[in-house]
Amino acid sequence: AGVFELQIHSFGPGPGPGAPRSPCSARLPCRLFFRVCLKPGLSEEAAESPCALGAALSARGPVYTEQPGAPAPDLPLPDGLLQVPFRDAWPGTFSFIIETWREELGDQIGGPAWSLLARVAGRRRLAAGGPWARDIQRAGAWELRFSYRARCEPPAVGTACTRLCRPRSAPSRCGPGLRPCAPLEDECEAPLVCRAGCSPEHGFCEQPGECRCLEGWTGPLCTVPVSTSSCLSPRGPSSATTGCLVPGPGPCDGNPCANGGSCSETPRSFECTCPRGFYGLRCEVSGVTCADGPCFNGGLCVGGADPDSAYICHCPPGFQGSNCEKRVDRCSLQPCRNGGLCLDLGHALRCRCRAGFAGPRCEHDLDDCAGRACANGGTCVEGGGAHRCSCALGFGGRDCRERADPCAARPCAHGGRCYAHFSGLVCACAPGYMGARCEFPVHPDGASALPAAPPGLRPGDPQRYL
């Protein structure tokens, strides 16, 4: 047994161009929190079960509001370590997923909205009891700096936390055949004899005579892989002529479920249905009641008032599993169209649409003239976040369906009278004025104040103004 510890040092824009926009704003203040998921990395099937080594959620960080115009700085972080306890041996090789989540604190319907800002993953070799290991991971334009270590919980010691130490019985030395427990030189390694034949690579024991398996291995001596690929080499385990025709053991072969649990294959893993009084990935944990809080992610625990009665977790939307430990990212298939931002609010999916788009899935293009008819010969003009019709003479309104009164705007100047006409309007000018809109005064001497005529035409030439 032991604890994996993760310390986040910073989360902010990575080096190089294209710095990300701050995830928070004055209108939408937010705070960050982190989730770490650990899986044993003993085989290609490290994803054999979700977060099989454990998972942890950090506290929420301080509320952050972006300063207008400022680039996104390193964002304020939650206090403290993320700690993932592990009950069995430390596998030595592990894979991790660290997620940075944003909690928006604006006026959200139905409570705060969570969205995933960044997810980094990796596979590392790490001995328990060693120093802090430092790491930098990038996700898009973001950069995460962190340290991690695995430490054993007493009395366990060693690189896998499988050796047990006991205080010395005599002050000077350990008993026959027993070594001092480094680094606890004042303690001795406990005499521990595992079941005969127990695999030294994949098995261990905490009590004499037992053989407990590391993640990914099963069988009485921990020699059977829980699930392997059906082909050990490109041609597989069968003859070179027939190719790979023998499916390997499935995840339920050898029944990894303890205490009478029944195993069923899931799309990528297995699931144990546990008898009353047991729970856990392999039904290995007993005597759990609702008082122990076995339901994660806000799941509601029902029943299980005493250790002999089963409890049931009723999971909130977006989570599943017997303990509501599996998160379902319903945004994964990008349900928001046209570049809309998907928010999984738990109780519902919400799309935040880009400018110019609307609808529950941002499916409506507000600028789109396609399929929007402008009546009576009008033409559709895109722009301004909404389509608009430029109407033919004599028509008006949003879709050019209304007959326009061409004289309504009083277009005839200087007291001219307006007459509506099928082709537009006609102005009858008051004495002393002329032009299509009666805009030009006629001088008493017969000369007009019209613009200069082109060469070859005299001002007042009747051809010019017919």
């Epitope: 099937e45 799309p267 990528r268 699931e271 599996k326 379902v328 319903r330 994964s332």
Partner: antibody, heavy 124, light 106 residues
């Protein structure tokens, strides 16, 4: 644009082995979260899931057909191969391959793109 | 094995009708998936994770339900909606489909 296409023999004799290939484009089986599955449909009947394979070589087989099925992938060729031994006339069906997506450990998001299918007849 | 039972097996309806197809699982499943299939064509994903519309699927389709009982609803039938509809679960192996519901023009 994502496409999948099934290929293989249209006529197979009883007891023979059927080998079907699914060639796909627009996604890669080296990408985390991606899988390819096989589904069949006898004439006039319902769909039946047969097997699937994930990017990390995790495989699942229908328990009733497990002893006869093998699924493999060739990531570099963008191909998934399904082998079915000891064919019988009741195996006459249209065989489809489809992309499967899982972004959440053990939760399938969707089986969202399908090939057009290939009709395999088992007859002597 | 989890059995999926669709009802009705077939139904006749008219353009503009509101239609509901149900899928009942023999034991609890977390999510339901719905597909539409037209004669001679491959199935097409309609709904994933119980209630999410697949890309390009009109908003007249919707999905709901939890546990063992799930529903596919078409709010106003269009001529192109006449097809066979299948439900499917991904809870445990085998990942079975329903027997199908054939939607015909009245």
């Amino acid at each position: 644009q994502i496409t999948l296409k099934e290929s293989g023999p249209t006529l197979v004799k009883p007891t023979q082995t059927l080998t079907l290939t699914c060639t796909f484009s627009g996604f890669s089986l080296s990408t985390s979260g991606m899988g390819v599955g096989w589904i069949r449909q006898p004439p006039g009947k319902a769909l039946e899931w047969l097997a699937h394979i994930w990017w990390d070589d995790v495989k699942r087989y229908s328990p009733s057909l497990k002893s006869r099925l093998t699924i493999t992938k060739d990531t570099s060729k963008n191909q998934v191969v399904l082998t079915m031994t000891n064919m019988d006339p009741v195996d006459t069906a249209t065989y489809y391959c489809a992309r499967i997506v899982s972004f959440d450990n053990d939760v399938v998001s969707a089986m969202d793109y399908w090939g057009q299918g290939t009709l395999v007849t088992v007859s002597s | 094995d989890i059995q999926m039972t669709q009802s009705p097996s077939s139904l006749s309806a008219s353009v503009g009708d509101r239609v509901t197809i149900t899928c009942s699982a023999s034991s609890s499943v977390s999510y339901m998936y719905w597909y539409q299939q037209k004669p001679g064509k491959a199935p097409k994903l309609l709904i994933y994770l119980t209630s999410n519309l697949a890309s390009g699927v009109p908003s007249r389709f919707s999905g709901s339900g939890s546990g063992t009982d799930f529903t596919l609803t078409i709010s106003s039938l269009q001529p192109e909606d006449f097809a066979t509809y299948y439900c499917q679960h991904w809870r445990s192996n085998p990942f079975t489909f329903g027997q199908g519901t054939k939607l015909e023009i009245k």
